[in-house]
Interface confidence: medium
């Protein structure tokens, strides 16, 4: 496997693009069991209807790979675990990509992204102790291809869930 992006290995802030800028996805640092900071993206606007919060990665080179794999480690709150939550609360989010030769795209319209899948928390998870909390870490892997442009952007769409993205890794398999 060749890793093209690993959010856990980025030093400092990830600085991905959130839309809207305020009130949607937030970059939040948490400490793992070794007291090492993990940069996560969180959103939890479960009380308000019609949520449409987008988070876009930086440009990811495909390095000639025709098919890439996206591994997402995330936690998703059960709507029933949150007090006062109505039918506005969701338990899924959506994963998209957009191919581009331009590594500095500033504005990408929502309708330019291609949907990869709707992601839900399954029954299997890894339990991680992070000091004052227990994280139930789900891992989902999706693949995309064939790719033809020099690189691509990933996007995560929240529609009203309570999510923390803990790590995003993009890789391809060497022949």
């Amino acid at each position: 496997e060749v890793t093209l992006l690993d959010s856990r290995s980025v030093q400092g802030e990830l600085g991905w693009i959130a839309s809207p800028l305020e009130g949607g996805w937030e970059e939040v640092s948490i400490m793992d069991e070794k007291n090492t900071p993990i940069r996560t993206y969180q959103v939890c606007n479960v009380m308000e209807p019609s949520q449409n919060n987008w988070l876009r990665t930086d440009w990811i080179t495909r390095e000639g790979a025709q098919r890439v794999y996206i591994e997402i480690k995330f936690t998703l709150r059960d709507c029933n675990s949150l007090p006062g939550v109505m039918g506005t609360c969701k338990e899924t989010f959506n994963l998209y990509y957009y191919e581009s030769d331009n590594d500095k795209e500033r504005f990408i319209r929502e309708n330019q992204f291609v949907k990869i899948d709707t992601i839900a928390a399954d029954e299997s998870f890894t339990q991680v102790d992070i000091g004052d909390r227990i994280m139930k870490l789900n891992t989902e892997i999706r693949d995309v291809g064939p790719l033809s442009k020099k690189g691509f952007y990933l996007a995560f769409q929240d529609v009203g869930a309570c999510i923390a993205l803990v790590s995003v890794r993009v890789f391809y398999k060497k022949a």
Epitope: V43, C44, P83, R133
Partner: nanobody
Framework: QVQLQESGGGLVQPGGSLRLSCAAS????????MYWVRQAPGKGLEWVST????????NYADSVKGRFIISRDNAKNTVYLQMNSLKPEDTAVYYC???????????WGQGTQVTVSS
């Protein structure tokens, strides 16, 4: 040791104002969303308001919208609830609740009594 300590409750006349505070300690406050919920006498818990980790997003129950304002100061590990134009039906014990987007446990305060009466 994790603690959430509410203060600022009391007896107020209809139309009056109160400011509730909830001081947090023992956990990474800035990583947590904060709720205010309330429990009126003989009733269940009712959600009042939520603020996200950075303070940029706030939500309110219809019953308090336009009258209550939630805010937070991450430097002081404190969340506030400014309650204006209070009504008798706002009488309740008010609790603050800290929760993270993707993990537990959630933390609760002991509550502060708000009584609106003439």
């Amino acid at each position: 040791q994790v603690q959430l300590q509410e203060s600022g409750g009391g007896l107020v006349q209809p139309g009056g104002s109160l400011r509730l505070s909830c001081a947090a300690s023992g956990f990474t406050f800035s990583s947590y969303y904060m709720y205010w919920v309330r429990q009126a006498p003989g009733k269940g818990l009712e959600w009042v308001s939520t603020i996200n980790t950075g303070g940029g997003s706030t939500n309110y129950a219809d019953s308090v919208k336009g009258r209550f304002i939630i805010s937070r100061d991450n430097a002081k590990n404190t969340v506030y609830l400014q309650m204006n134009s209070l009504k008798p039906e706002d009488t309740a014990v008010y609790y603050c609740n800290a929760f993270a987007a993707g993990w537990g446990p959630d933390y609760w305060g002991q509550g502060t009594q708000v009584t609106v009466s003439s």
